[in-house]
């Protein structure tokens, strides 16, 4: 029945793998979308939530037009990897306010982890360099209260949206452009 | 309700340009893109373009690009599509529909407006 | 980009049978577990109308009439037992890849 999840299809077509990766990044989209309106419905948010730690938004309106491969997938790599972070620790330090998401937080960070081997894989097929992060990482703290970790789960979730809603953009026209 | 309310019907002429305006109301603005699509009479639902109204980065159909704009203005919860250098291949009814890039399909539509270019 | 071929192009049916549409794309619309196909209604002078998403869900609303199946190139829509409401022109959709393309539609008209 194919190969198992993680192990994506041996090919030296950079466009189907940049396909590949543009449908798992759709995917992730799809959890993400669906665990933050579970957010909404369980702990309703009073406005917008933001959290110093997550990455800034990688784009504004403008830059969709002069947009390169290198630069779109180191930057969409290092922008999960903190995602990634931060939602092992939602589900770590999270408290029994979110335990109740916790199948589905693990669900998301697994196929947060398939998307970056994806990811991972692509740039070595391309021959770019597997970048470091910039900024030295700064450890998360434990939530100063429940109210703060459901507000952390807000930040996290609508962040980790708009950079994939951002990714599933630019990827899509890279991909025209092959 | 979720609604969707466009502008009025235009007549423009060939070489001319056109905004249409989607007002959205019944649910979150920024919490959904929006997507335009194109019917010509006698032709296949065209889809034109999509806009994040939280970090705008429209996407086009190509066949549209440089000559289709969208923006949103959040504030007022609405999203515009302009269309310059009109032509008499842009006569359509022009709609807006509610959409998300996951699995991109549009379930609320506004109800259309006609544009008519004609000299 | 992908091509959408709908078929028939016109059916004409009586209240009460069952009408089966077709839609064809032109390369394989499914993967990573999902068939993005979706289907839609349109009366004359009206906007279209969600029916079915991702090849077999059925959208909030829609009576369960109204069924979608088909997965890789070959999509069908089924309406198990027509009511005078339902003749009007049905379009398939893909969002595969961008652009997203509809088919040319299906005209269901009473017999």
């Known amino acids: 029945p194919g190969p198992p999840a993680g192990s994506p299809r041996v090919s030296s077509d950079p466009r189907a793998d940049l396909d590949s990766a543009v449908l798992l990044t759709r995917s992730l989209l799809a959890d993400t979308r669906q665990l933050a309106a579970q957010m909404r419905d369980k702990f309703p948010a009073d406005g917008d939530h933001s959290l110093d730690s997550l990455p800034t938004l990688a784009m504004s309106a403008g830059t969709l037009g002069s947009l390169q491969l290198p630069g779109v997938l180191t930057r969409l790599r290092v922008d999960l990897m903190s995602y990634l972070r931060h939602v092992q620790w939602l589900r770590r330090a999270g408290g029994p306010s979110l335990k109740t998401l916790e199948p589905e937080l693990g669900a998301l960070q697994a196929r947060l982890e398939r998307l970056l081997r994806r990811l991972q894989l692509l740039m070595s097929r391309l021959a770019l360099p597997q970048a470091a992060p910039d900024q030295p990482v700064i450890p998360l703290g434990p939530p100063a209260s429940a109210w703060g970790s459901i507000r952390a789960a807000h930040a996290i979730l609508g962040g980790l949206h708009l950079t994939l809603d951002w990714a599933v953009r630019g990827l899509l026209l890279l991909k025209t452009r092959l | 309700e979720v609604q969707l309310v466009q502008s009025g019907a235009e007549v423009k002429k060939p070489g001319a340009s056109v905004k249409i305006s989607c007002k959205a109301s019944g649910y979150t603005f920024r919490d959904y893109n929006m997507d335009w699509v194109k019917q010509a009479p006698g032709q296949r639902l065209e889809w034109i373009g999509d806009?994040?109204?939280?970090?705008?980065?429209?996407i086009y159909n190509q066949k549209f690009t440089g000559r289709a704009t969208l923006t949103v203005d959040k504030s007022a919860s609405t999203a515009y599509m302009e269309l310059s250098s009109l032509r008499s291949e842009d006569t359509a009814v022009y709609y807006c529909?509610?959409?998300?890039?996951?699995?991109?399909?549009?379930?609320?539509w506004g109800q259309g407006t006609t544009v008519t270019v004609s000299s | 980009d992908i091509v959408l071929t709908q078929s028939p192009a016109s059916l004409a049916l009586s209240p009460g049978e069952r009408a089966t549409l077709s839609c064809r794309a032109s390369?394989?619309?499914?993967?990573?577990?999902?068939?993005?196909i979706h289907w839609y209604q349109q009366k004359p002078g009206q906007a279209p109308r969600l029916l079915i998403y991702l090849a077999s869900n059925l959208e909030s609303g829609v009576p369960a009439r109204f069924s979608g199946s088909g997965s890789g190139t070959d999509f069908t829509l089924t309406i198990s037992s027509l009511e005078e409401e339902d003749f009007a022109t049905y379009y398939c959709q893909h969002s595969r890849d961008l652009p997203p393309t509809f088919g040319q539609g299906t005209k269901l008209e009473i017999k």
């Open positions: 529909a509610r959409g998300e890039l996951a699995h991109w399909y549009f379930d609320v």
């Open positions: 806009i994040n109204p939280t970090i705008g980065a429209p």
């Open positions: 390369k394989s619309v499914s993967t990573e577990g999902y068939s993005y």
